[in-house]
């Protein structure tokens, strides 16, 4: 007895598609071995049609695929555009066709129901609109036009040209008779219901001379599109419901075990708290289509999702819907990274953002999720250097550590920085991830002056005190610009006295600017790192003024002034619509913070190599 299991019998009709799921014991060997779908021939041989190694037979080209779900111990064979030639005996299996583990599947494709001659078939999804065309002869042009529904042996009048409308079709049906010369009338039915399914009869005139035309209306539940995404990744539901509902409220809901549909998000401002910080409803286009992006996918996000339109912003029968079945793959290619990062007021955070390692050249972005209305995510920083003006001097995006991860550093934290942030690129959209920054009680670990005024031509020495817990870390100073933070030479001046209860491992590392030039004005960061992984940072603003007093200045934390006021976002800066998330290049118009000059910052620290700490900084 084979441990592979699946449907023994599959039946469908021509033109349709099937999705055949086969189950196998998810042992390590089974999970990674070849999966196949083959057809049994008269000789007993089983000819491969599609396999997990990418093979697709010419007969299946463009209409079939096989997807393996190793964490579930399943694989799915999708076959579209079925014809009666596809009827036959198949096997789904693992390993080699002739001696692997397999399961027999019988597929029967039928022609569909027999219909009266000349019947026109209309296949429409529930909630959509159908237009039934009814031709007639010239002599019946002035006579009554009508549409009947055949129920068993009887015909029930649905609508006629004398203004009769069957109550079941009230407010959603109309009969149109064109001008003279056009020998066709049409019946338009909106917001189709499953109960509208059936055989209809168009009639013009009466008696033996009347014109008749049969129409078979097939109202389908929208076939759920199977969507397979990785744990921690992102999914986008594209919803196109038609122009008829372009101005109606839109929603995405998830079917629950009671078969009702819980709203996940809608355009009326409702949002499920389980999706806080990780969902956006992108504004609709002129045709009424819209999309919903969900990041930070969890196993519990699996299920059936419906998007739709209704003035109440929730599912109602007879209104158009689209359906998806979301599966979340636990054997994710997206690496684990913290979903919550904690920092203290005045301190900093370093956020690791994953991206598809095959897309190392892609542009990297970081945006702040805002929950108002449908949600939006204005970009704060990008790898090409744009930084929102109010983040000047305290935000940087670094390409390190590379190979599928970049780093975002935010310092000078305030309680207003708490919230959800998204990591994204202009490449693979499935790699969008969410991180929540929380501001907790505590003191920053690095101690630096608040702000510093340097004198042109003189020497400036800026101290940074590192507690002993950072003894094994690399310490560095860098000069911030909107394209990164350029490392500068710095000097280890021995143990720091800023930390009591601490041994010789606490350090005072200083940055010396000698002589100070105009180009030295700007933001400087001191920080710690381990290899290419960044830790805490602290920022100091250096202002440069004309020489007034002779001699060098040494700034100690005791003499530090308060940090300069943050610059306020210029009112002229365009609001970033969340549709830009789909194409981050739309953010190019964002105001760019002016580059603060020479990245080396004119630093000329006369430091011998033994006391200098070289640091890679931003690899841009």
């Amino acid at each position: 007895k084979s441990p592979v299991f699946g449907p023994q019998e599959v039946s469908s009709v021509e033109g349709n598609s099937v999705s055949i799921k086969c189950y196998y014991p998810p042992t390590s060997v089974n999970r990674h071995t070849r999966k196949y779908w083959c057809r049994k021939g008269a000789s007993g041989r089983c000819i491969t049609l599609v396999s997990s190694e990418g093979y697709v037979s010419s007969n299946y080209a463009g209409r079939a695929n096989l997807t393996n779900f190793p964490e579930n111990g399943t694989f799915v064979v999708n076959i579209a555009q079925l014809s009666r030639d596809d009827s036959g005996h198949y096997k789904c299996g693992l390993g080699i066709n002739s001696r692997g583990l397999s399961f027999d599947v019988s597929l029967e494709v039928s022609q569909g129901p027999e219909l009266p001659n000349g019947t026109e078939v209309y296949t429409v999804d529930v909630g959509r609109t159908v237009t039934i065309k009814c031709p007639f002869k010239t002599e019946n042009a002035p006579k009554t036009k009508a549409l009947y529904k055949k129920i068993g042996q009887t015909s029930v009048l649905v609508i006629d040209s004398r203004n009769y409308v069957n109550p079941n079709y009230k407010d959603r049906i109309r009969l149109r008779i064109p001008g003279t010369g056009q020998l066709i009338f049409t019946v338009v039915i909106d917001r189709l219901r499953l109960s509208d399914h059936g055989l209809y009869l168009c009639q013009a005139g009466d008696g033996s001379n009347r014109d008749e035309k049969n129409a078979d209306l097939q109202v389908l539940e929208p076939e759920p599109e199977l969507v397979y995404e990785d744990l921690r990744g992102s999914v986008t539901f594209h919803c196109a419901l038609g122009l008829e509902v372009a101005n109606v409220a839109k929603f995405l809901c998830r079917v629950n075990s009671r078969e009702t549909c819980d709203v996940v998000i809608n355009t009326l401002g409702k949002r499920d708290s389980a999706f806080e910080g990780r969902i956006l409803l992108n504004p609709q286009d002129k045709d009424g289509s819209f999309s919903v992006v969900i990041t930070g996918l969890r196993k519990e996000d699996e299920g059936r999702y419906l998007c739709g339109a209704h003035s109440d912003g929730q599912l109602q029968e007879g209104w158009p819907i689209q359906a998806w079945q979301l599966f979340v793959n636990e054997e994710s290619t997206i690496p684990r990274s913290p979903t919550v990062v904690k920092g203290v007021a005045g301190g900093s955070v370093a956020v690791l953002c994953p991206y598809n390692p095959k897309e190392s050249q892609s542009l990297k972005y970081w945006c702040l999720w805002e929950g108002a209305q449908n949600g939006r995510c204005p970009l704060l920083v990008e790898s090409q250097g744009l930084v929102q003006e109010q983040y000047e001097g305290r935000l940087s995006l670094l390409q390190e550590p590379g190979n599928g991860t970049f780093t975002v550093i935010l310092n000078q934290l305030t309680t207003q920085d708490a919230g959800f942030y998204w990591c994204l690129t202009n490449g693979d959209t499935r790699w969008r991830t969410t991180v929540e920054i929380k501001i907790i009680e505590g003191e920053p670990n690095l101690k630096v002056p608040g702000n510093v005024t340097a004198v042109l031509g003189e020497t400036l020495n800026i101290p940074c005190h590192f507690p002993c817990k950072f003894s094994s870390y690399e310490k560095y100073w860098c000069k911030w610009s909107n394209t990164g933070c350029q490392t500068l030479p710095s000097q280890d001046e021995g143990p720091s006295e800023a930390f009591v209860n601490c041994d010789e491992n606490s350090r005072l590392v200083s940055l010396t600017l000698n002589p100070v030039t105009r180009a030295d004005e700007g933001w400087y960061w001191c920080g710690v790192k381990q290899g290419h992984f960044y830790g805490e940072t602290a920022a100091v603003y250096v202002a440069v003024e004309e020489k007034k007093v002779a001699g060098s200045r040494y700034v100690s934390p005791a003499k530090a002034d308060a940090a300069p006021d943050e610059k306020v976002l210029d009112s002229g800066v365009r609001e970033i619509e969340n549709k830009a998330i789909q194409d981050p290049r739309l953010f190019a118009e964002e105001k760019v913070v002016a580059d603060t000059g020479d990245q080396a910052g004119g630093s000329r620290a006369s430091v011998d190599s033994s006391s200098s700490e070289e640091q890679g900084g931003s690899s841009k």
Epitope: S12, I20, E223, P224, S257, R258, E259, E317
Partner: nanobody, 126 residues
Framework: EVQLVESGGGLVQAGDSLRLSCAAS????????MGWFRQAPGKEREFVTT??????????YYADSVKGRFTISRDNAKNTAYLQMNSLKPDDTAVYYC?????????????????WGQGTQVTVSS
């Protein structure tokens, strides 16, 4: 909610046939699959057969022990599933339960089903 009512159980001789029905009522619109499980005295509930559908496509799953003898079918218009049992054996004696699901990851697993009927007794004497 979806309500399921089984009927058609009874006492038969080995080799005979029996047809069980399971009528669904309530919010059946998003029901995706209906199946049959059975439970013999002192044993765990076991999978017998399930039918799932998507539009005009049907998928039928059977346990090895009933393959070739039992057939599952459904009448969409009546929201009813049927289990035709031929060549019955004494081992088939059990209470047969109808189950329905909105989303099925694995049709063999009872916990995947959202709704259950009260069960109908099938006894096969030798």
């Amino acid at each position: 909610e979806v309500q399921l009512v089984e009927s058609g159980g009874g006492l038969v001789q080995a080799g005979d046939s029996l047809r069980l029905s399971c009528a669904a009522s309530g919010r059946t619109r998003t029901t995706y699959g209906m199946g049959w499980f059975r439970q013999a005295p002192g044993k765990e509930r076991e999978f017998v057969t399930t039918i799932t559908w998507s539009g005009p496509t049907n998928y039928k799953y059977y346990a090895d022990s009933v393959k070739g003898r039992f057939t599952i079918s459904r009448d969409n218009a009546k929201n009813t599933a049927y289990l035709q049992m031929n060549s019955l054996k004494p081992d088939d004696t059990a209470v047969y339960y109808c189950a329905a699901s909105t989303v099925l990851t694995d049709p063999r697993v009872p916990t995947e089903y959202d709704y259950w009927g009260q069960g109908t007794q099938v006894t096969v004497s030798s």
